[in-house]
Interface confidence: medium
């Protein structure tokens, strides 16, 4: 029977034993920076080219005996997971191995840097198709290793790395903490985070997604036909490297940003038991398990968005946190979150010619997070419209006044320490949905975008009684671009997007009391792009794209407004 | 790649002509920073990656490395250039005493210096 891990990453609509996508990554070269490998193993023979690159430190301990099978163990297994004949993810992918880890699985940052430089020079000397670099290693946070990864990613290389096996925040490790790298945590056959002895998979905002990483059957270096089970975030990263190779083989022109968004989009959502993670990390950790797309044709017609959390601001009164999108992504909305509820909102601002999302801590607050909604929107022209705090009791409002611009997100930022002492705004006037409304003490920021065929609608869900969490989701075919709360009172801890759902969190019910002050509305802005759909149809002909126009016609834009007990 | 070392005489001239103080301060008072691994057992003191500012050319990297060696030698310290980076990041990898960090951070073109550290199979 098929190994559990290969079944898990296979799209649900196919039986795994029937599903073998064409070319299985054959247009892609995967570089593996790891231990030495047994290149004549039956699983990988002829698929892996061993480069002459070697940069490893001396093994520790005077009694260490270098045994070939032990030296090759880690790298051989991973090469098998990526491209092995029987147990590999991308059976058509060719690989190149660089030795940066010694027989004890130890290497250096400098050796890894020189390895990455070697790859870049090889790429310049002999440009090939898409490149994937697998880094199944981790060290402490390293500015220089992250910088090198960033440079290589900006040269068009896809880097995939292990989140780390330290049962800790992945942001404390490198290259896991490099934003440009696709960082992978490990889950098991039960979709639970992997425990490894007293430790386990890393977690947190620096993890992009999880993948199978426990009891993974793959090539063993004990003999040329041997197999062995290994566990770790390296194995998980190898799965994602294989999936990336498959996707890039099907769509060689995919950018790193497009690939990352697709990996997130096609992942299984909300299957991981978050109780395994420390409480403060649960909201930051993506509940995503990697899977192959259901067809080798990408979903070019989709508007893809992902949520990017900032680092924690720290507790000082004027502390801020900044969340950034990747260079090829558009920041379509910005929200904030504070566990204590003491925050001064958030705003979108330009930094180095690009919009960023900045959240502001408040006096007595333990700190805030900024949450960016980062989307792929080709030919987009986005700007931020700001309204200063209003004098009128109706609250502050701002709309997208430029022709053809649609509202994709609302943010609000205030200077007063506690909005709770001020009355919230009254009902939003009907018939003017394309605007942001906020507290009269707050400045309001509207993200307004023009892109071919972009259309958006506002969806709200209000709860009259105080509740710790209010959610509102976008329907099938629509993508969540904006997530915010009404009203902006102090018992709201913040708002953030989880996949296609807008989540508004409030203070514990017991502390709020059930006054009308407790009413909370989650506001989602849902968008889609007709332009992307049409472009996709033209690309794919009438086979896989048929009927998209009919679907769009059937879903005429309606502005859904569900107001519940606003006082 | 071969180290474009220039004439050794250039190094000796540098030894004789440079003032006895520290290396000239980086331009516009921007201070280079030193980084090391937060996990002590993973640190590898004695080997450092000297990262130079983004637009630094290979020849400048090599010149900066030579300058460090010359100034270190005047203070009785040995330095060994293990690699000159170009292609991804400009800079060089050097074996030297940690006592030289203050001097190295003041070299022109230096952006930051990071002490080498261990990485592990996961």
């Amino acid at each position: 029977s098929i190994p559990w891990n290969l079944e898990r990453i296979t799209p649900p609509r196919y039986r795994a034993d029937e599903y073998q996508p064409p070319d299985g990554g054959s247009l892609v070269e995967v570089y593996l920076l790891d231990t030495s490998i047994q290149s004549d193993h039956r699983e990988i023979e002829g698929r892996v080219m061993v480069t002459d690159f070697e940069n490893v430190p001396e093994e520790d301990g005077t009694r260490f005996h270098r045994q070939a099978s032990k030296c090759d163990s880690h790298g051989t297994h991973l090469a098998g997971v990526v491209s092995g004949r029987d147990a590999g993810v991308a059976k058509g992918a060719s690989m190149r191995s660089l030795r940066v880890l010694n027989c004890q699985g130890k290497g250096t940052v400098s050796g890894t840097l020189i390895g990455l430089e070697f790859i870049r020079k090889s790429q310049l000397v002999q440009p090939v198709g898409p490149l994937v670099v697998l880094l199944p290693l981790a060290g402490g946070y390293s500015r220089v290793l992250n910088a090198a990864c960033q440079r290589l990613a900006r040269a068009g290389v896809v880097l995939v790395t292990a989140a780390g096996n330290f049962r800790d925040d992945a942001c404390l490790y490198s290259p896991a903490s490099a934003p440009e790298v696709i960082t992978v945590g490990a889950t098991n056959a039960q979709d639970q985070p992997v425990t490894l002895g007293t430790l386990g998979t890393n977690f947190g905002r620096c993890v992009d997604l999880f993948a199978p990483g426990e009891d993974i059957i793959g090539a063993s270096s004990d003999c040329s036909t041997c197999f062995v089970s290994q566990s770790g975030t390296s194995q998980a990263a190898a799965h994602v490297a294989g999936i990336a190779a498959m996707m890039l083989s099907a769509e060689p022109e995919l950018t790193l940003a497009e690939l990352r968004q697709r990996l997130i989009h096609f992942s299984a959502k909300d299957v991981i038991n978050e109780a395994w993670f420390p409480e403060d990390q649960r909201v930051l950790t993506p509940n995503l398990v990697a899977a192959l797309p259901p067809s080798t044709h990408g979903a070019g017609w989709q508007l893809f968005c992902r949520t990017v959390w900032s680092a924690h601001s720290g507790p000082t009164r004027m502390a801020t946190a900044v969340a950034r999108c990747a260079p090829d992504e558009e920041l379509l909305s910005c929200s904030s979150f504070s566990r204590s509820g003491k925050r001064r909102g958030e705003r979108m601002e330009a930094q180095g010619g690009k919009l960023v999302c900045r959240a502001h801590n408040a006096f007595g607050g333990e700190g805030v997070y900024a949450i960016a909604r980062c989307c792929l929107l080709p030919q987009a022209n986005c700007s931020v419209h700001t309204a200063p705090p209003a004098e009128a009791s109706m609250g502050t409002r701002v709309h997208c006044h430029q022709q053809g611009h649609v509202l994709t997100g609302c943010s609000s930022h205030w200077e007063v320490e506690d909005l709770g002492t001020h009355k919230p705004p009254v009902l939003r006037p009907r018939g003017q949905p394309n605007q942001c409304v906020g507290h009269r003490e707050a400045s309001i920021h509207a993200s307004c975008c023009h892109a071919p065929g972009l259309e958006c609608k506002v969806k709200e869900h209000g709860i009259p009684a105080p509740q710790e969490q209010v959610t509102v989701a976008c329907e099938e075919g629509w993508t969540l671009t904006g997530c915010s709360a009404l009203p902006g009172t102090s018992h709201v801890l913040g708002a953030y997007a989880v996949d296609n759902t807008c989540v508004v969190r409030s203070r514990d019910v017991s502390t709020t009391g059930s006054t009308s002050e407790g009413a909370v509305t989650a506001v989602a802005i849902c968008c889609r792009s007709r332009h992307l759909a049409q472009a996709s149809q033209e690309l794919q002909g009438s086979t896989s794209g048929s009927g998209l126009n009919d679907i769009f016609e059937a879903q005429k834009i309606e502005w859904h407004e569900h107001h519940h007990h606003h006082h | 790649q071969e180290d474009e070392d220039g004439d050794y005489e250039e190094l000796v001239l540098a030894l004789r002509s440079e003032e006895d103080g520290l290396a000239e301060a980086p331009e516009h008072g921007t201070t280079a920073t030193f980084h090391r691994c937060a996990k002590d057992p993973w640190r590898l003191p004695g080997t450092y990656v000297v990262v130079l500012k983004e637009e630094t050319h290979l020849s400048q990297s090599e010149r900066t490395a030579r300058r460090l060696q010359a100034q270190a030698a005047r203070r009785g310290y040995l330095t060994k250039i293990l690699h000159v980076f170009h292609g991804l990041l400009p800079g060089f990898l050097v074996k030297m005493s940690g006592d030289l960090l203050e001097l190295a951070l003041k070299l022109p073109h230096v952006d930051y210096i990071e002490e080498d550290s261990s990485v592990f199979a996961q």
Epitope: E54, N55, V56, P57 | E2, V12, G76, L78, L82, V84
Partner: antibody, heavy 121, light 107 residues
Framework: QVQLVQSGAEVKKPGASVKVSCKAS????????IHWVRQAPGQGLEWMGY????????KFNQKFKDRVTMTRDTSISTAYMELSRLRSDDTAVYYC??????????????WGQGTTVTVSS | DIVMTQSPSSLSASVGDRVTITCKAS??????VAWYQQKPGKSPKLLIY???NRYTGVPSRFSGSGSGTDFTLTISSLQPEDFATYFC?????????FGGGTKVEIK
């Protein structure tokens, strides 16, 4: 045990090139720089340069810079030194040596047995 | 290049003698000096590093001293196996130059 084993003696004509190999064993080859030193008959030792096998970075004595090439093959833990445009005064024993670095001390702790290169018409 | 001038170029001594070899650097090399022993037809062997540190396995009769420009290798009580040529080397600056050698012969 740690050792460096060099290739056998060579006899070359002036203007030719010679490539001497140095095979390392008993330690991690890429963990140490390999230096090349030569000794003309009855003379002292002359440093030619070094290679860092882990990155292929090389540094040469100016005297040899235009004629020497240092390479390595990590798969067989071997370093190579090639000297071109040979002259009769290149007749010497060529040694490879491993450099050990401790803090602010360094030295050549392991030497190859030497390769005699004779340049004669 | 830094010139290492070694003296004497040769000396004759008997077993049990105290032998001193000196090496003078043309400029300050601090303590970056190593001493090697070479027997005919053999490769050099490390004795002393960083001017005064005895290498592992080297008998205690060998000692080194000096800093700056003047360095000394001393054999406190010459043994039959010590008859060889001795070289100093500076590692302070590239190129890493050697002294001309001192041949210690049996008197």
């Amino acid at each position: 045990q740690v050792q460096l084993v060099q290739s056998g003696a060579e006899v070359k004509k002036p203007g030719a090139s010679v490539k001497v190999s140095c095979k390392a064993s008993g330690y991690t080859f890429t963990g140490y720089t390999i230096h090349w030193v030569r000794q003309a008959p009855g003379q002292g030792l002359e440093w030619m340069g070094y290679i860092n096998p882990s990155s292929t970075y090389t540094k040469f004595n100016q005297k040899f810079k235009d004629r020497v090439t240092m390479t390595r093959d990590t798969s067989i833990s071997t370093a190579y030194m090639e000297l071109s445009r040979l002259r009769s005064d290149d007749t010497a024993v060529y040694y490879c040596a491993r450099e050990r670095i401790y803090s602010n001390y360094w030295f050549f702790d392991v030497w190859g047995q030497g390769t005699t290169v004779t340049v004669s018409s | 290049d830094i010139v290492m001038t070694q003296s004497p170029s040769s000396l004759s001594a008997s077993v049990g003698d105290r032998v001193t070899i000196t090496c003078k650097a043309s400029q300050n090399v601090y303590t970056a000096v190593a001493w090697y022993q070479q027997k005919p037809g053999k490769s050099p062997k490390l004795l002393i590093y960083s001017a005064s540190n005895r290498y592992t396995g080297v008998p205690s009769r060998f000692s080194g001293s000096g800093s700056g420009t003047d360095f000394t290798l001393t054999i406190s009580s010459l043994q039959p196996e010590d008859f060889a040529t001795y070289f100093c080397q500076q590692l302070s600056s590239s190129p890493e130059t050697f002294g001309g050698g001192t041949k210690v012969e049996i008197k």
